[in-house]
């Protein structure tokens, strides 16, 4: 297993609809054809997997149907979008990139993006 540098923004403020988008960029030391991207959430020293996708270079990222993540890739950049976030989901989201094929296997873990989510004001009741 060889180390690889992964860059991601330090802080992201989610949209009022609870959507956070950011770029995860990795310094690929070789010509990988198969890449796996995982988003991890760290809270109180607990690390949980938010979502993961494996893709072939030049193709779309495919997350599971019930995933809260979507994404696209462009060269060594992965554009990640996490949806359905609430204030309670505020936390550190870490981008992990693995170059799966061809060998050698490379692993890179970013420093994390602190995502802040502010729940919008509820709309006042209306007759309309």
């Amino acid at each position: 297993c060889k180390a690889m540098h992964v860059a991601q923004p330090a802080v992201v403020l989610a949209s009022s609809r609870g959507i956070a988008s950011f770029v995860c960029e990795y310094a690929s030391p070789g010509k990988a054809t198969e890449v796996r991207v995982t988003v991890l959430r760290q809270a109180d020293s607990q690390v949980t997997e938010v979502c993961a996708a494996t893709y072939m270079m030049g193709n779309e990222l495919t997350f599971l149907d019930d995933s809260i993540c979507t994404g696209t890739s462009s060269g060594n950049q992965v554009n990640l979008t996490i949806q359905g976030l609430r204030a309670m989901d505020t936390g550190l989201y870490i981008c992990k990139v693995e170059l799966m094929y061809p060998p050698p296997y490379y692993l890179g873990i970013g420093n994390g993006t602190q995502i802040y989510v502010i729940d919008p004001e509820p709309c006042p009741d209306s007759d309309f």
Epitope: P9, A10, V11, V12, L13, A14, S15, S16, R17, I19, A20, S21, F22, V23, N79, T81
Partner: nanobody
Amino acid sequence: QVQLQESGGGSVQAGGSLRLSCAASKYTSCMGWFRQAPGKEREVVAHIDSGPRTLYADSVKGRFTISKDNAKNTLYLEMSTLKPDDTAMYYCAAGPMYSGSCNYNYWGQGTQVTVSS
């Protein structure tokens, strides 16, 4: 790169007011104020984007007002009815909007606000 310079911090009695300013070297879609008290995590205070959409932390709603002068590329935070809990280092941050969310890539050095009872 965007350079940010905060000013306006200081010491004030509880119930008092302060106005923070942040001068940016160039325009960015998103600007906001964050704060960090000793031993605590950094938290978002208020934010404004190109909408202009504003967001406030629950703890400051009704007391703090964020505004931006686009002609001067300057961000402001009017703070009134200050409480000792508002004591912290206040940071100005800026960055682009990406798919509706703000990526805060640029940070100022911070200005200290101390509220005594």
